[in-house]
């Protein structure tokens, strides 16, 4: 008689990352009997929702249902039908929705209500949609990468099973760059965290972690660009803005009303004698870098040391995983290799930004012009943020690892969020037989 394969005893979970520029759906899978083990959850699918972030639906909420359909239907296909009713679905919205809430709590609530209505009508175990805090976003990103890197495992290994593993239990710091905010999270070395808002205490798998985190709202790459434009147009002599962060020959018309739509540009807002202005690229890395530095107020620090804008930042410690837009931008620029020094990155950026727009368009014919046009700014911004904002140096640059995926799972906050909400990160080290835990992150 043939042995029949027993049905897989697995569980699934779905997290939607409702970011400022787009929404992505992630499907995770794990063996049911190993829920409390570290490193057993892995991503089986990512589905990028077509269209902008959910905050852009504020005037067309009736379109949210259609917007989410394709990826939710994909989830129905990927997850076995017998598991649908038991599969939790979570939606976390980040800085795009934080900004909308700052403008109008009522409008943000309406968007979330309609998102929830749409997601509730699928046959999964929908657990609600919410705007996560910047602190959560940083913390869950840190949990994700360290979980995937095996840093919470008590078993020390003589061999490396994942890239970047330094064969010790020192956790990695997490650097996350989105469209509207950026997060820095790490365990400082024997340093008291001087501002309580930036301090997190975790007990994970029997070990205590004192973690520093901060989320800089308005310092994601898209909002930083809006800030820079709003700052620079203040001193423009007419409706032409000669911009070093765009390639020579690049031209784009910007509506002043769009520029001042976001709360991030309020501090630069002024009455301008025109409704539109034209960006004309001049492609100069050094000037672009200088312009970006003006977004960081480093003149004021009420602590022993700061990042910028008076925000406490302890001395950097250990290795860092830089993911999300840090990775996507650097990957496009072919600058993610461990071997590329900071000086080399700067050199490459100088060359890239100086390339004429027509040449760039020809070289990258398959890339949407909207995205293509902004890589010079984004790359320069990443360098400025890491070096002047967070105080990385040419020497400590080698401790930054640009990470897209670890073990097939995307680096980002979503996995950590799900692990926490499904109680899969025990406070104590599990025994060989799973225990029921009452204390979680």
């Amino acid at each position: 008689t043939q042995n029949k394969a027993l049905p897989e005893n697995v569980k699934y979970g779905i997290v939607l990352d409702a970011g400022s520029s787009h929404t992505s759906l992630y499907i995770y899978k794990w063996p049911a009997e190993k829920e409390n083990d570290t490193g057993v959850v892995h991503q089986v699918e990512e589905c990028r929702v077509k269209g902008p972030g959910i905050s852009k639906f504020v005037q067309k909420v009736n379109e949210i249902g259609i917007y989410l359909t394709d990826c939710m239907e994909r989830a129905r296909e990927v997850i076995p039908r017998s598991q649908h009713q038991e599969t939790p679905v979570y939606l976390g919205a980040t800085a795009g929705m934080r900004l909308l809430r700052m403008e109008s709590e009522e409008l943000a609530d309406r968007v979330l209500d309609v998102v929830e209505r749409s997601l509730s009508n699928y046959p999964f175990d929908f657990q609600g949609a919410r705007i996560i805090t910047g602190q959560e976003e940083g913390a869950y990103g840190w949990i994700t990468i360290n979980y995937l890197l095996g840093k919470f495992s008590q078993k020390t290994r003589w061999f490396s099973i994942v890239p970047y593993e330094t064969n010790n239990q020192e956790t990695f710091g997490a650097l996350d760059l989105g469209g509207a905010s950026t997060q820095v999270t790490f365990v400082p070395q024997n340093q008291t965290i001087e501002s309580p808002d930036n301090a997190l205490q975790f007990r994970l798998y029997g070990k205590d972690y004192n973690v520093y985190t901060h989320s800089f709202l308005c310092y994601g790459k898209d909002q930083a660009l809006w800030q820079k434009l709003a700052k620079d147009i203040q001193v423009a002599s007419n409706e032409i803005l000669r911009d070093p962060c765009f390639h020579p020959g690049y031209k784009k018309v910007v509506n002043v009303s769009d520029l001042y739509k976001t709360p991030c540009t309020k501090r630069f807002e002024m009455t301008l004698p025109f409704q539109q202005f034209e960006i004309q690229g001049i492609g100069n890395y050094q000037q672009c870098h200088q312009s970006i530095l003006e977004l960081f107020n480093t003149s004021y620090c009420p602590y022993s040391q700061c990042a910028f804008n008076g925000i406490f930042l302890p001395p950097l410690q250990g290795d860092f995983g830089a993911f999300s837009a840090f990775y996507f931008v650097m990957k496009f620029l072919n600058l993610t290799s461990e071997k590329v020094s900071q000086e080399k990155v700067t050199e490459m950026m100088k060359k890239f930004c100086a390339q004429p727009w027509e040449e760039i368009k020809t070289s990258y014919a398959g890339v949407k012009e909207k995205y293509l046009s902004e890589y010079c700014f984004s790359g320069t911004y990443i360098l400025s943020l890491l070096l002047q904002g967070y105080h990385f140096t040419a020497d400590s640059w080698e401790h930054i690892h640009f990470i897209g995926k670890i073990q097939g799972s995307d680096a980002g906050w979503t996995l950590g969020y799900m692990l926490n909400l499904t109680n899969m990160i025990p406070a104590e080290q599990p025994l060989s037989t799973p225990l029921s835990h009452s204390t979680y992150v």
């Epitope: 609530d109 309406r110 309609v114 929830e116 209505r117 997601l119 509730s120 009508n121 046959p123 929908f126």
Partner: antibody, heavy 119, light 107 residues
């Protein structure tokens, strides 16, 4: 356990208005939406509208001009106001809890409150 | 508005029968259909959602099927306590709409 209890029904004159209440227990209005559905004598069910957990509302367009749904989370109560009543508004009015957070199908219904529009 | 049509207003059945109640949508509603049971003097009770998913606590003799425009609620082994009105409901788009109902009676 989950319960919804409607009140406020009775006899109303044509052209008048009614205000129905739905007191809920066993769940929080900050976690689930509540719909209103009515059933005319010997007829099928007709959806009126919903109030979602953060307070936004959606109405059946056929009632938009004369219907308002509101809630008071602290009193665990949802309200339905219907104006310019007509004879064909005579029905049993139900409030119903969304089966999932904000879904459009219902796992718990109230017992209903009868409204009779008559001169 | 989407019209949900339950063409059989009444159906005569016997205990132990297999009963199929049909519901037709005037346009595609995907699988966004629920079925309710309503006994005289009571409020409706949810049986099926997403066209074919049984609500918790509902006996497994109740099965839903269909997608698009044609939907069926099947009772595989009719019991006397199943004598009731059955309504379908679409929730694919607003306004939410219900079928006119099918009443099960004993032959």
């Amino acid at each position: 356990q989950v319960q919804l209890v409607e009140s406020g029904g009775g006899v109303v004159q044509p052209g008048g208005s009614l205000r129905l209440s739905c007191v809920v227990s066993g769940f929080s209005l900050t976690n689930y939406g509540v719909h209103w559905v009515r059933q005319a004598p010997g007829k099928g069910l007709e959806w009126l509208g919903v109030i979602l957990r953060r307070g936004s509302t959606d109405y059946n367009a056929a009632f938009m001009s004369r219907l308002a749904i509101s809630k008071d989370n602290s009193k665990n109560t949802v309200y339905l106001e219907l104006n310019s009543l007509r004879l064909d508004d005579t029905a049993v009015y139900y409030c119903a809890k969304t089966a999932v957070v904000a879904g459009d199908y219902f796992d718990y219904w109230g017992q209903g409150t009868t409204v009779t529009v008559s001169s | 508005d989407i019209v949900m049509t339950q063409s059989q207003k009444f159906m005569s059945t016997s205990v132990g029968d297999r009963v199929s109640i049909t519901c037709k949508a005037s346009q595609n509603v995907g699988t966004n259909v629920a079925w309710y049971q309503q006994k005289p003097g009571q409020s409706p009770k949810l049986l099926i959602y997403s066209a074919s998913y049984r609500y918790s606590g509902v006996p497994d003799r109740f099965t839903g099927s269909g997608s698009g425009t044609d939907f069926t609620l099947t009772i595989s082994n009719m019991q006397s306590e199943d004598l009731a009105d059955y309504f379908c409901q679409q929730y694919n788009s607003y306004p939410l709409t219900f079928g006119g109902g099918t009443k099960l009676e004993i032959k």
